[in-house]
């Protein structure tokens, strides 16, 4: 019996087409994904196999401003709109809390939405329970397929799911429901979650009775043969995964953004061990149309949001100085203002031992595009943040030893006076340089503002200390020169987008006045 | 081979209630969605109620709510229609036949032969 | 409710004729339209699913287009056994609807 899974992950908003790159869609000739695209595809696929489903592997919230405006009722919208069979939780579908889960998808997506390791308590508990199950058994043709879900159990610091969800160890968590499975004579299982790659690996290497793992959060791309694109390949798809119980088992991931559709066909004997596993994803791009009707759709949603792209945010009564006269050679106040949303966006009060599990900011000045004059009455729009940051990317949380952020700092003035975008904006830092040094010699004082405290202090980095930072997914990926970040870097989650973080924290403000106050010098 | 069997049509007064079965087999019954069409005399096709693979869900038209329940027995491989306070415009052959294997609203591939149903005092 | 509208409600043609039978929605429906034949004091049989798709078995002089509104279902060269009656179906949404139907009868 063979079973067609098309699968997605970390779609992150990316309704409409993009570029190349996942951001905005300029030249709609060279464009990809996008759901009407997306559509167009798997209806091609449904046409010509007969026992196809198709699965989210979480984290459709957060990225563009759709989800800005729509708060996830987009999400169900067009995920019911392409059939989808099941989702599994990722942990941006918590980034508006319990209730910006429960009400605009929960309660309205047609499909399940999974996760065995989320478990809910106190006054919650009741109001969510059968919202979101920790698995579904589907019926495909005349046969069925378990899926079992599973979520990061670090979501409590990468989102605000709140303190009435535990998130426990996936694997603990997923052994158990797949038993239940295989009591319920379900020999077919997949495993479908929001972990990352590593987990995902885990999983089909420690959970009996799992067949398949579909995964995300890592945005991992695997690829058998020649890349379509400029993805490069993390490994084979599928990747194998010898299991404890010497079962050959197949991990997928689809990169993210909607610009791939996994497609993975598998062949299951009659009692539902893999025989085989084979495929690939799909390139989404120009080439596959766009679907008329589900695009009208798009269209038709649309125009609320170029409404809200010029709604006062909030207001500033200071001049915002993005420019790169400042931003690459100084600390700008534009910079200041950007880092503080970035850890504002990023307050999580988990243990009473940490004010906050993170308190440090990174920001590349290049990325800094424009300034915003507080002449215009003081108004800030979405439109005028595009401006500032237009790259669409988002704002990271890495784990980075004292050695590597070093690094990075004497990397940020290596060649300083060349209006180069590598000259870093900060936030809980103080830095001091000395420009008179040799390149790689540079940084003289180095001080953090402590997170394990209950008055937060600067005090001097040290280099063996690991150390969470907030940071564009630009320099987290080794942009401008930061390789030592990339390649020393011992934890990466992708986090929200950097205009939703800095329009929210706006918003939250209602009055901005970010100075320069010598946190560069 | 796949079939489906409707049984249970007739003559009924108005007011009072019909129960129609359809047996299925030849298809893991209990993986599909079941739904029952009607045709009155001479007039098209009119959907009058589905079930969903598992029961959880059951959805029919304004014309019939309140007045009709489907159900199934998926050990029987078994569909029913329950139909009371019928009215002359019930009149019509009852079809049921087989839908997809999701929540999501599905064509019909696989029809049984029909069961007339006739309302008349 | 979705509204299904069929023109023409019937037809006369010749064996060997091209034959076409269109179908409007009252709103989108994407692709979830089906196609049925229905022969005299006989049950339907599926033609086409998802505007497009032929079921199995079905002979290729059957096609089916269409997405959104408006839906075509096309018989290449019409067979002494396709003439009876054509229905489209929507299943973009409970409450499912049939067209009125299309009577295609030997000119």
């Known amino acids: 019996w063979e079973l067609t899974i098309l699968h997605t992950n970390d779609v992150h908003s990316r309704l409409e087409q993009t570029s190349e790159d996942s951001s905005k869609c300029v030249n709609a000739s060279r464009c990809m994904g996008g759901v009407a695209r997306l559509f167009t595809k798997v209806q091609q696929i449904r046409r010509a196999e007969p026992n196809v489903l198709l699965l989210d592997a979480g984290d459709q919230y957060q990225g563009t401003i759709w989800f800005t405006v729509y708060k996830g009722a987009e999400v169900a919208h067009f995920m019911n709109a392409l059939r989808y069979d099941a989702m599994a939780l990722g942990n941006h579908e918590f980034d508006n809390g319990v209730e910006g889960l429960i009400e605009p998808l929960l309660k309205e997506a047609k499909f399940p939405i999974l996760s065995a390791n989320i478990k809910a308590k106190g006054p919650l508990a009741s109001q969510i329970s059968g919202l979101y199950l920790p698995y579904k058994v589907l019926p495909v043709g005349d046969e069925v397929v378990g899926i079992v879900g599973y979520t990061s159990k670090e979501t409590p610091f990468l989102s605000n799911p709140g303190t009435n969800l535990v998130f426990e160890d996936e694997i603990t968590a997923l052994q158990p429901e797949v038993d239940k499975l295989k009591t319920l004579n379900v020999n077919k299982i997949i495993a479908l979650g929001h972990s990352g790659f590593e987990m995902d690996k885990l999983i089909a290497q420690k959970v009996r009775g799992v067949d398949v793992v579909v995964g995300g959060h890592s945005n991992t791309f695997l690829y058998t043969g020649n890349p379509p694109s400029k993805e490069v390949p993390a490994g084979k798809y599928p990747f194998i995964v010898t299991s404890d119980d010497g079962r050959k088992v197949p991990v997928v991931q689809a990169y993210a953004f909607g610009k791939y559709l996994g497609y993975l066909k598998i062949e299951f004997d009659e009692r539902g061990n893999v025989i085989s596993s084979h495929g690939n994803p799909i390139l989404l791009n120009s080439s596959i149309p766009e679907d008329p009707s589900i695009k009208a759709d798009i269209n038709k949603w649309r125009i609320k949001l170029d409404n809200y792209s010029t709604q006062e945010l909030g207001k500033t009564i200071v001049y915002l100085d993005g420019s790169s006269q400042s931003c690459r050679f100084r600390e700008c106040n534009m910079g200041n203002l950007i880092c503080d949303a970035m850890i504002n966006n990023n307050l999580r009060h988990t243990d009473e031992m940490f004010w906050n599990h993170v308190s440090m900011c990174i920001l590349n000045g290049g990325g800094i595009r424009s300034p915003i004059d507080e002449r215009n009455n003081g108004t800030i729009t979405w439109e005028n943040l595009a401006a500032v940051l237009p790259f669409g990317g988002t704002f990271d949380l890495v784990q980075l030893k004292g050695s590597t952020l070093k690094k990075a700092f004497e990397h940020s003035v290596h060649r300083y006076g060349q209006s180069t975008g590598e000259f870093l904006q900060v936030g809980g830092i103080h830095v001091v340089y000395d420009l008179s040094r040799k390149p790689g010699d540079r940084v003289v004082k180095l001080d953090v503002l402590c997170t394990k405290c209950r008055v937060p202090s600067y005090d001097p980095l040290k280099m063996d200390e690991v150390y969470k930072v907030i940071l564009p997914n630009f320099l987290a990926n080794g942009g401008d020169g930061f390789q030592m970040i990339k390649d020393e870097l011992l934890r990466h989650d992708s986090g929200d987008q950097d205009i939703n973080v800095v329009s929210t924290y706006i918003s939250k403000m209602k009055v901005i006045y970010p100075a320069v106050e010598g946190r560069i010098k | 081979q796949v079939q489906l069997v409707e049984s249970g049509g007739g003559v009924v007064q108005p007011g009072r209630s019909l129960r129609l079965s359809c047996a299925s087999s030849?298809?893991?019954?209990?993986?599909?969605?079941m739904h029952w069409v009607r045709q009155a005399p001479g007039k098209g096709l009119e959907w009058v109620a589905v079930?969903?693979?598992?029961?959880?869900?059951?959805y029919y038209p304004d014309s019939v709510k309140g007045r009709f329940t489907i159900s199934r027995d998926n050990s029987k491989n078994t569909l029913y229609l329950q139909m009371n306070s019928l009215r002359a415009e019930d009149t019509a052959v009852y079809y049921c036949?087989?839908?997809?294997?999701?929540?999501?609203?599905?064509?019909?591939?696989?029809w049984g032969q029909g069961t007339m149903v006739t309302v008349s005092s | 409710d979705i509204q299904m509208t069929q023109s023409p409600s019937s037809l006369s043609a010749s064996v060997g004729d091209r034959v076409t039978i269109t179908c409007r929605a009252s709103?989108?429906?994407?692709?979830?339209l089906a196609w049925y034949q229905q022969k005299p004091e006989k049950a339907p049989k599926s033609l086409i699913y998802?505007?497009?798709s032929l079921q199995s078995g079905v002979p290729s002089r059957f096609s089916g287009s269409g997405s959104g509104t408006d839906f075509t279902l096309t018989i290449s060269s019409l067979q002494p056994e396709d003439f009876a009656t054509y229905y489209c179906?929507?299943?973009?949404?409970?409450?499912?609807?049939f067209g009125g139907g299309t009577k295609v009868e030997i000119k």
């Open positions: 709103q989108g429906i994407s692709s979830w």
């Open positions: 030849g298809f893991t019954f209990s993986n599909y969605g």
């Open positions: 079930i969903l693979y598992d029961g959880s869900n059951k």
């Open positions: 998802a505007a497009s």
């Open positions: 179906q929507q299943y973009n949404s409970y409450p499912l609807t």
């Open positions: 036949a087989r839908g997809g294997s999701s929540w999501y609203p599905d064509s019909f591939d696989i």
